[in-house]
């Protein structure tokens, strides 16, 4: 956030940039958390994303019995590996076709025994506050589907009648990794020393990192005619003085008519 300075006073302003602001010859260039001519004001909202999508990766092992292992399958650039990859991918696309979060598979290693396939199942979902539940459910469905197919598509009399056949006991889920996104944590971190006063509120399923000085949210502080300003001790209302009134009180809701004060009378309304 930047504020331009014109005129002779600019040189003085240069040495007075606050809160880590730097002078660029015209103005104070303020760090993310601050704004104002001297970077003296704390912002009331911080952009914390979110990411458009959240990903998960499941490390799985299946044993393909309808293909005999050959040395060429160890080499990822061989024609054999490429053909196996294509057939395996097609088979898995069929297996997981009913899972909207399914993106694809990535073979990490092929090893002997008929062909033991170490691979990742990749999942992705649009970010919503419920993304963890969505991906947890998707990983459960992946487990169900791979268990089912490796139980059903098996060799009979040494012959497979499916695109691929599997060893029922060779299916294992090694690890599940979900991209972590914690808006509350991000909000606290980015608010630095003001972290205690910034909160996450959702609007249209999008998280907003805001202080009570940001209007339009349930935690917003109503300063009436005053101005909300953040300090290290929290949000405070700076009350204004108009031609006719002084305003005071925690939310500047107490107006005192100047004429009454000058006439030695106090009147609150």
């Amino acid at each position: 956030r930047t504020t331009t300075c014109f005129g002779d006073g600019c040189q003085n302003t240069a040495s007075r940039c606050k809160n880590g602001g730097t002078w660029d010859g015209l103005k104070c260039q303020c760090p993310n958390l601050y704004y104002g001519e001297l970077c003296e004001e704390v912002v009331s909202s911080i952009d914390i994303g979110p990411p458009e999508t959240i990903s998960a990766q499941m490390e799985l092992t299946v044993t393909v019995t309808s293909v005999k292992f050959t040395e060429e399958l160890k080499n990822h650039s061989s024609q054999e590996f490429q053909e196996f990859k294509q057939t395996f991918t097609e088979q898995m696309n069929i297996v997981y076709s009913g899972i909207p979060e399914y993106v694809g598979v990535n073979i990490t290693k092929l090893r002997l025994g008929s062909v033991v396939v170490e691979h990742d199942v990749l999942l992705r979902t649009k970010y919503t506050p419920e993304y963890k539940t969505v991906l947890d459910n998707a990983t459960e469905v992946v487990k169900e589907k791979i268990t089912k197919v490796t139980t059903q598509q098996i060799m009979i009399n040494d012959i497979c009648s499916d695109m691929m056949c599997f060893n029922t006991t060779g299916t294992q889920v090694q690890n599940i990794t979900v991209t972590q996104y914690d808006p509350e944590e991000d909000c606290r971190k980015m608010a630095k020393e003001y972290g205690d006063y910034f909160v996450v509120e959702y609007r249209d399923q999008k998280p907003y990192c805001i202080s009570p000085c940001e209007p339009g949210f349930s935690v917003s502080k109503n300063c009436n005619l005053g101005k909300c300003q953040m300090s290290l001790s929290g949000p405070q209302c700076l009350c204004v003085t108009t031609e006719t009134h002084w305003y005071s009180g925690e939310t500047c809701n107490q107006g005192t008519q100047k004429s009454l004060v000058y006439g030695h009378h106090h009147h609150h309304h």
């Epitope: 005999k68 050959t70 024609q79 053909e83 497979c160 009648s161």
Partner: nanobody, 123 residues
């Protein structure tokens, strides 16, 4: 690029014989699996027989004892000797190949295909 070309199809009487050939180019003949599939009018493509690089063979129940699959790795050729042909053997016969050592009669496992040759068994 792998190319498979079938030949040897034709019209034959029930009980007769035919020998189908498949010439493979661009295919490393000493590796993988070669197979014969067939598709009768209005039916799904079905596996007839396959042969692996080490000579291991397998046949569909309906052709066991009547058909013989063989390959010559040096000539990059595949054959299907069909004896005691029946009306239900009428179909387009396809040659298929895979670089992998397969043990499946499912067409989806084979990436390389010929155009097919028609076999009609009729009196």
């Amino acid at each position: 690029d792998v190319q498979l070309v079938e030949s040897g199809g034709g019209l034959v009487q029930p009980g007769g014989s035919l020998r189908l050939s498949c010439a493979a180019s661009g295919f490393p003949s000493s590796r993988g699996t070669m197979a014969w599939f067939r598709q009768a009018p209005g039916k799904e493509r079905e596996g007839v027989a396959f042969i692996n690089s080490d000579g291991r063979t397998s046949y569909a129940e309906s052709v066991k004892g009547r058909f013989t699959i063989s390959r010559d790795n040096a000539l990059s050729s595949l054959w299907l000797q069909m004896n005691s042909l029946r009306a239900e053997d009428t179909a387009v016969y396809y040659c298929a190949a895979s670089l992998l050592y397969l043990m499946t009669v499912n067409a989806a496992a084979y990436p390389y295909w010929g155009q097919g040759t028609m076999v009609t068994v009729s009196s």
